[in-house]
Interface confidence: low
């Protein structure tokens, strides 16, 4: 689901198409209705519409299942621990929650793409807000993790000690608060719009062109560029420090967080490049023509799908890169499968029994 702006009455880039209380696909948006008819033509959208109908429901259904299982497993492993969570683990728990909440909305958008929005305006607002809250939260929490690691390693500052979790909790609350703020447009402007001609309803925004561009810029900057810049800056410094100190164990310990950040960049960069093209077309810096518009529509669908895959990717990364995660997951499964065989709950052979599975432990770097 790529939430963008449409008043659901105007065709693509054509005011006159406004004629037309029209139905645009959920991924193709027009401008506000106006009396100055016909400033540019509606573009034929058969390819992008059919592509969305075929591609998105299948993809979203798959991501829903994978995301729910994977992030559920991550949350279960983290919450099953008896010791206090490290700062990074706490952020990762929140990340798993954010990803889970995001994938929970995917079946709704799958139905919207395939048929129509059948869930009413209330759920349209909630699902849209949930979607964007968790889109932003995912990016910002990854930025928090990298900043935490940066302080911890580069400045040897343990901002979030294992003791009182107040700071990490406050940081997470601030992230969620900020995301709620970013999602205000969803609560205000999203609604289930019924199209009298097609007798179909879709969950869409209802505000003008300037709002559409502003929202896209916010998404690009707050949801991608800023977090990515923070991550890049922090990890560049961390790697420099670790390389200078020849800390091979430390470097190994950094694998997971670096891989998670690289995955974020790889998954979301294509989508945001497409959004950037769209912004440039909105602002008139790039000529808007029908061929380009159609390609952008399809590219948006494909790259947003790639972006949502990121929700399912983190658990896989933990499973394949994080040794401790695999061990704890195995133990959890054994415990669930054999509740009476307490002997199976042995700690793994690692010397640091309480070290974090996700990060460079504050005391030692044997966490992975």
């Amino acid at each position: 689901m790529v939430l963008e702006v449409s008043d659901h009455q105007v065709l693509n880039d054509a005011e006159v198409a406004a004629l037309l209380e029209n139905f645009s696909s959920s991924y193709d948006y027009g401008e506000n209705e106006s009396d100055s008819c016909c400033t540019s033509p509606p573009c034929p959208q058969d390819f992008s519409l059919n592509f969305d109908r075929a591609f998105l429901p299948a993809l979203y259904s798959l991501l829903f299942l994978l995301g729910l299982l994977g992030n559920g497993a991550v949350a279960a492993v983290l919450l099953s621990r008896r010791t206090a969570l490290s700062s990074t683990d706490t952020f990762l728990l929140h990340l798993a929650v954010a990803d889970t909440l995001l994938v929970l909305t995917l079946p709704l958008w799958a139905v919207d793409a395939a048929v129509q929005w059948v869930f009413g305006s209330g759920l349209c607002k909630v699902a849209g807000a949930l979607f964007n809250i968790n889109f932003y939260a995912g990016a910002l929490l990854l930025a928090c993790i990298s900043f935490d690691r940066y302080l911890n390693i580069v400045h040897a500052t343990q901002l979030y000690r294992r003791g009182p979790p107040a700071r990490v909790t406050l940081t997470c609350l601030a992230v969620w608060g900020l995301c709620l703020l970013f999602a205000l447009p969803d609560f205000i402007f999203l609604s289930a719009h019924h199209d009298e001609r097609l007798n179909a309803t879709h969950c869409q925004y209802n505000f003008p062109q300037v709002g559409r561009t502003a929202l896209r810029v916010l998404q690009l900057v707050a949801g991608f560029l800023l977090p990515l810049l923070v991550m890049a800056y922090c990890y560049a410094h961390i790697l420099a420090v670790l390389l200078v100190s020849r800390g091979q164990r430390r470097l190994r310990a950094m694998r997971l967080v670096v891989v998670v950040v690289v995955a974020f960049a790889l998954c979301w960069t294509p989508y945001h490049l497409v959004v950037l093209v769209d912004i440039l077309m909105d602002l008139g810096a790039l000529a808007r023509n029908c061929g380009r518009e159609s390609r952008v529509d399809v590219a948006k669908s494909v790259t947003s799908g790639l972006g949502y895959m990121h929700c399912c990717l983190n658990p896989l990364l933990y499973a394949f890169v994080g040794v401790k995660f695999r061990e704890r997951m195995w133990m959890l499964l054994l415990r669930l499968g054999c509740p009476n065989q307490r002997g199976l709950q042995r700690q793994p052979s690692s010397s640091r029994r309480d070290s974090s599975w996700s990060e460079t432990s504050e005391a030692s770097y044997s966490g992975l």
Partner: antibody
């Protein structure tokens, strides 16, 4: 079969008024945006007005804005064009035309035209 | 307003001839639409989105072009193709039509 039948044309004096009608059949009238297009005696085609399928939105070129009003009665499957302050240059054959729907969008061209009704503005 | 200029205004062709009608726009347009009108009849949609033939239009017709220059081509002129052809743009307000090209049989 799509049919559009215009009526109401005639001879009017400059400054006078006239209302054209277009009876639609053979398709779901309420689903389509409709327009009036005129053809001058010199055979030039000019777009005159457009109305959205629900009747909420109307559009006009500057040449007729303020003088012509397009409307529709979806219960009667009928399109109207109320013309006032008529001028000699409004003399033309007036066609009612349907906007097609393509991939879920209305388009700016016309896929069906009526046979037309003639308006002559002359003193 | 975008002006559409059709050329030639009148064109005589023999059966079997390849015929090309031109439509030039005063500024760039995304698509051109073509209509055929025979004497005593209303216009009929002939080509939409520059190159798509309307239902029932023979395959000998084709449309092409981009930007400011568009054309309608008949690969092999037939008697029933004698008519006036109009181009139309929907890129900017108002909708405008070309002046028409009257295609006659020699």
């Amino acid at each position: 079969e799509v049919q559009l039948l215009e009526s109401g044309g005639g001879l009017v004096q400059p400054g006078g008024s006239l209302k054209l009608s277009c009876a639609a059949s053979g398709f779901t009238f309420t689903s389509y945006a409709m327009s009036w297009v005129r053809q001058t005696p010199g055979k030039r085609l000019e777009w005159v007005a457009t109305i959205s399928h629900g009747g909420t939105y109307t559009y006009y070129p500057d040449s007729v804005k303020g003088r012509f009003t397009i409307s529709r009665d979806n219960s009667k499957n009928t399109l109207y064009l109320q013309m006032s302050s008529l001028r000699s240059e409004d003399t033309a054959m007036y066609y009612c035309a349907r906007h097609p729907i393509y991939s879920g969008n209305y388009q700016g061209y016309f896929d069906y035209w009526g046979q037309g009704t003639t308006l002559t503005v002359s003193s | 307003d975008i002006q559409l200029t059709q050329s030639p205004a009148i064109l005589s062709a023999s059966v079997g001839d390849r015929v090309t009608i031109s439509c030039r726009a005063s500024s760039g347009v995304n698509y051109i639409y073509w209509y055929q009108q025979k004497p005593g009849q209303s216009p009929k949609l002939w080509i939409y989105f520059t190159s798509n033939l309307a239902p029932g239009v023979p395959a000998r017709f084709s449309g092409s072009g981009s930007g400011n220059s568009y054309s309608l081509t008949i690969s092999s002129m037939q008697g029933e193709d004698a008519a006036t052809y109009y181009c139309q743009q929907f890129t900017s307000s108002p909708y405008t039509f070309g002046g028409g090209t009257k295609l006659e049989i020699k």
